[in-house]
Amino acid sequence: ESGYAQNGDLEDAELDDYSFSCYSQLEVNGSQHSLTCAFEDPDVNITNLEFEICGALVEVKCLNFRKLQEIYFIETKKFLLIGKSNICVKVGEKSLTCKKIDLTTIVKPEAPFDLSVVYREGANDFVVTFNTSHLQKKYVKVLMHDVAYRQEKDENKWTHVNLSSTKLTLLQRKLQPAAMYEIKVRSIPDHYFKGFWSEWSPSYYFRTPEINNSSGEMDPI
């Protein structure tokens, strides 16, 4: 699908002092959706500040956010999911800044989980598998995944592979022998819905076999 901007681009707020960003999570708790907003500047005094969303809601005109420490949060079934909502920072009845946002364009998927790597001796490869709660969802079902892996000693030398399935094969010859690797995965919406990368899954660590001197192949772990 054609897009207008990079995934996750958000509008500037009217007043820089109160600039904020939000992300939505659909069916995050059964059929309930959530919307989370926070100020860009962690030093903003949030004591009397509230967030409100109006428009593109079912049965109600507006909803107020709950404040949870530095973040503002709504969990509801009342998002229409079509049309733009107006999200405002308020002090009492006065709006300080507002953004028109379509909640389907700021979706942040849940992090993948159950990441594992299995070495196949006969095939000389590693099968990477992971799970995602989105396979069971009705809205954000189609995701693009980013698998990142690195040799543990290479601090910032990550190799990334994008895939739409939850299974990836890494060829043994592409990896260093007798090395410890770290691997992790994250997801982003990939059909109709737009938004942000999920949090990374917990990392999984695996060791590649030694090279077998006689055959030039790696020994199994």
Epitope: E11, I82, G83, K84
Partner: antibody, heavy 118, light 111 residues
Framework: QVQLVQSGAEVKKPGASVKVSCKAS????????LHWVRQAPGQGLEWMGG????????AYNQKFKGKVTLTSDRSTSTVYMELSSLRSEDTAVYYC???????????WGQGTTVTVSS | DIVLTQSPDSLAVSLGERATINCRTS??????????MHWYQQKPGQPPKLLIY???NLESGVPDRFSGSGSETDFTLTISSLQAEDVAVYYC?????????FGGGTKVEIK
């Protein structure tokens, strides 16, 4: 009130270009994407493309890529559609339309008739 | 491209009677309960006017004699009691996939 006002009718020769404007008022210009839809004489509606005035990002119907260029000017709350290499089949009414959501059109300009004739 | 087929091409209905227009799509335009189908009214010499968005949501200011229903590939626009001012061409439009396509239109007249 919310309004989209388009520039006037144009008569052009084949091979020429035309630039149609659409001035928005009554709302914050950067809040909504603006699209262009054409209607050939006696025909239906055809989506050509859209622009996000906030970022300048564009999306085009593949059919019109290379034919249409969309731009916007935030200082005047105006979007422009330029049609190049005009042919007689480009004769149509061209509408700009605001996208109230993804992607339906809740406010329309009055239309600009472009006639291509030698 | 997703093809939208409207039926009938034209419709003559008595004043005060019900008018029903159908729109069938070549593939689903629904994601669960999110139905990406919209309806417009166009009178001669005027731009189209949004009536219904998201299959069943009435646009602000549109009379409630207009209603929409449907899901997946089959959608309906209903005018419950036709008024003289409803004479127009009606178009459906999908927005699940670029390019966003319109139906061919249904002309509604008074019988």
């Amino acid at each position: 009130q919310v309004q989209l006002v388009q520039s006037g009718a144009e008569v052009k020769k084949p091979g020429a270009s035309v630039k149609v404007s659409c001035k928005a008022s009554g709302y914050r210009f950067t809040d909504y994407e603006l699209h262009w839809v054409r209607q050939a004489p006696g025909q239906g509606l055809e989506w050509m493309g859209g622009i996000d005035p906030k970022t300048g990002g564009t999306a085009y119907n593949q059919k019109f890529k290379g034919k249409v260029t969309l731009t916007s000017d935030r200082s005047t709350s105006t979007v422009y559609m330029e049609l190049s290499s005009l042919r007689s089949e480009d004769t149509a009414v061209y509408y700009c339309a605001r996208s109230g959501g993804r992607w339906y059109f809740d406010v329309w300009g009055q239309g600009t008739t472009v006639t291509v004739s030698s | 491209d997703i093809v939208l087929t409207q039926s009938p091409d034209s419709l003559a209905v008595s004043l005060g009677e019900r008018a029903t227009i159908n729109c069938r799509t070549s593939e689903s335009v629904s994601i669960h309960l999110l139905h990406l189908m919209h309806w417009y009214q166009q009178k001669p010499g005027q731009p189209p006017k949004l009536l219904i968005y998201g299959a069943s949501n009435l646009e602000s200011g549109v009379p409630d004699r207009f209603s929409g229903s449907g899901s997946e590939t089959d959608f309906t626009l209903t005018i419950s009691s036709l008024q003289a001012e409803d004479v127009a061409v009606y178009y459906c439009q999908q927005s699940i996939k670029d390019p966003y396509t319109f139906g061919g239109g249904t002309k509604v007249e008074i019988k």
